[in-house]
């Protein structure tokens, strides 16, 4: 009896892994061996495929095989038992383009109200990433354990911290990766879960800003508790994105190391052009805070965005504000080459509760104000840019009385 | 693979100084940071400090702060301890080891034993 | 600086026991915790990381829990070759300190 050919074959290839799959054409035949062969691009001859040799069962792994994978391959396939059948060719690939995403590796490290997720792609140094490496980008799916309900986290890089959390609380999260460039989207990890610690007994620094004063640039936060020490760190951003490095070497701000107010000053040579990350951390000597938000630190960014200037023309139940360049100094206004849009917040002297104003022009009314009441002012600027999300820091206040009633315009 | 190799026992007077060098193999001492352990005679383990050999920046606990010196030398990929006004107490067997991913000390020298005696 | 207590201090035990050895820290260090096993002359070997993580070619028998201020390292049936001194070391802030160690013994 005639051996007939195999068919469907399918060719599997995640990360560095080459899987065949492939059905049998007669199922009553017993003690059938399959082989394979392939051909690269531009070559007559075709080659045994090693590791798919007389195999007995309808799998088989080619993945030792150092092919290039950006090159056109052909295999085909047949069956045997005392004669062969004809052979089957399989549709021309090539490797890089037909391959998955592998599921990633993701370590993780809790905190009280904070999970630090380390990613490393599923195949160290592998051939079929290769030139990619870097080009990694990941996304994330979390939950609490107890309730189901999934918050999707889009473009991390291979280290991402989750803050905001509930300590004692357990979370389960999964990743994929993706390669943007090539248009190719990762399988899931299996699931993680972390519980979060007890309550630290000092909470972490708040509300970190960065301003610029003359030639230093100004940290500032807010702690809950006095008579503290701080240390600020500062790491290069783009490391988060090295893949399979997961020892960041945090610097010391040595203007910043064991300072006892809520700021502290550096000189802007601290920092050369780039994009930062900045931590602090607080001590009272015998316990110590865990790390802060990380917040990003563009120096390009920052030695620009300075608070606005502006001047209040005061109406009976109104303020005109007229917003103006910065000043840097000696006077000089700072031209801003980037679209911004201004946050206006005022009260009443007298009055703790604040009323906010979002704004892209630089004539701004703040409406609704009572005659002959002191009103205070403060104004920041924001870039538009969504990547870079720059905030300057605010204004000093400014206080002006409105004028009587029925005063005409 | 990854090696890090010691140098020899030492026996030194009281209020002298020693260096103890630790030699890594197998990777870039640049890329980690190098840390140096303390274990006295029948006792456990002591951190001393660590350095990152990139920049020389150092961090040092603060019982051996001021007696301790931590180096590096990464054009033969070489770290250095320095233990000054030495005293009975530094007799001990000092560790190098390699601080990697997530911060852990995964390699380990094989130590070397520094002797105080007159 | 955080101190680390580890208890028992000896153990006397006997090959295919569960053996639990804890650590406390005297503040939150989340879970950034190592343990190491060191064999007489020998330097110490790492063999938890990150309070739960077991390092590639470490045996699945040991294994590691806990969080904030207490961690366990558990061996599930104890071999010949586990009698050792086990130490926790917290890699949370600086300096990193030890545990005094767990000299596991033969009874």
């Known amino acids: 009896k005639n051996l007939k050919s195999p068919q469907k074959v399918e060719v599997d290839i995640i990360d560095d892994n080459f899987i065949l799959r492939w059905n049998r054409s007669d199922e009553s035949v017993g003690n059938v061996t399959f082989s394979f062969d392939y051909q690269k691009t531009g070559m007559d001859n075709w080659i045994k495929l090693s590791g798919c040799q007389n195999i007995t069962s309808t799998k088989c792994n080619f993945s030792s095989l150092k092919l290039n994978v950006y090159e056109e391959i052909k295999l085909r396939i047949r069956a045997e038992k005392e004669n062969t059948s004809s052979w089957y060719e399989v549709d021309s690939f090539t490797p890089f383009r037909k391959a998955q995403i592998g599921p990633p590796e993701v370590h993780l490290e809790a905190e009280d109200k904070a999970i630090v997720i380390h990613i490393s792609p599923g195949t160290k140094d592998s051939v079929m990433w290769a030139l990619d490496g870097l080009s990694f980008t990941y996304s994330l799916v979390i939950w609490k354990n107890s309730s189901g309900v999934e918050e999707r986290i889009e473009n991390i890089y291979s280290r991402h911290k989750i803050y905001k959390l509930s300590p004692e609380t357990t979370y389960c999260l999964k990743v994929k990766a993706a390669l943007l460039t090539s248009w190719k989207i990762g399988v899931y990890s299996p699931v993680h879960c972390i519980k979060t610690t007890v309550e630290n007994e000092l909470p972490p620094p708040e509300n970190i800003e960065v301003s610029v004063q003359n030639q230093n640039y100004v940290l500032k936060w807010d702690y809950t508790y006095a008579n503290m020490t701080f240390q600020v760190q500062w790491l290069h951003a783009f490391l988060k994105r090295n893949p399979g490095n997961h020892l960041y070497k945090w610097k010391q701000i040595p203007d910043c190391e064991n300072v006892k107010t809520t700021q502290c000053v550096f000189p802007q040579n601290v920092f050369q052009k780039g994009i930062y990350l900045l931590r602090v951390q607080a001590s009272d000597g015998n316990n110590t805070s865990f790390w802060s938000e990380e917040i990003k630190f563009d120096t390009e960014i920052q030695a620009f965005l300075l608070p606005p200037v502006f001047n209040i023309r005061s109406l009976s139940d109104s303020f005109h504000i007229y917003i103006g360049a910065p000043k840097q100094s000696g006077n000089t206004p700072v031209i801003q080459d980037y679209p911004l849009i201004y946050e206006i917040i005022f009260w009443e002297n007298t009055s703790n509760a604040e009323r906010k104003i979002i704004e892209k022009k630089t004539d701004v009314t703040v409406p609704n104000l009572k005659p002959l009441t002191v009103y205070c002012v403060k104004a920041r600027a924001h870039t538009m840019d969504e990547k870079l999300n720059k905030s300057s820091v605010f204004s000093d206040a400014v206080c002006e009385k409105t004028k009587p009633g029925n005063t005409s315009k | 693979q990854v090696q890090l190799v010691q140098s020899g026992a030492e026996v030194v007077k009281p209020g002298a100084s020693v260096k103890v060098s630790c030699k890594g193999s197998g990777f870039n001492i640049k890329d980690y940071y190098m840390h140096w352990v303390k274990q006295a005679p029948g006792q456990g383990l002591e951190w001393i400090g660590r350095i990152d050999p990139e920049d020389a920046e150092t961090k040092y606990a603060p019982k051996f702060q001021g007696r301790v010196t931590i180096t590096a030398d990464t054009s033969t990929s070489t770290v250095y301890l320095e233990l000054s006004s030495l005293r009975s107490e530094d007799t001990a067997v000092y560790y190098c080891?390699?601080?990697?991913?997530?911060?852990?000390?995964?390699?380990w020298g094989q130590g070397t034993l520094v002797t105080v005696s007159s | 600086d955080i101190q680390l207590t580890q208890s028992p201090s000896f153990l006397s035990t006997s090959v295919g026991d569960r053996v639990t050895i804890t650590c406390k820290a005297s503040q939150n260090v989340g879970t950034n915790v190592v343990w190491y096993q060191q064999k007489p002359g020998k330097s110490p070997k790492v063999l938890i990381y990150?309070?739960?993580y077991r390092v590639s070619g470490v045996p699945s028998r040991f294994s590691g829990s806990g969080s904030g201020t207490e961690f366990t390292l558990i061996i599930s049936s104890l071999q010949p070759e586990d009698f050792a001194t086990y130490y926790c070391?917290?890699?949370?802030?600086?300096?990193?300190?030890f545990g005094q160690g767990t000299k596991l013994e033969i009874k």
């Open positions: 990150s309070a739960s």
């Open positions: 070391q917290q890699k949370n802030n600086y300096p990193y300190t």
């Open positions: 080891a390699r601080g990697g991913n997530f911060y852990v000390m995964d390699y």
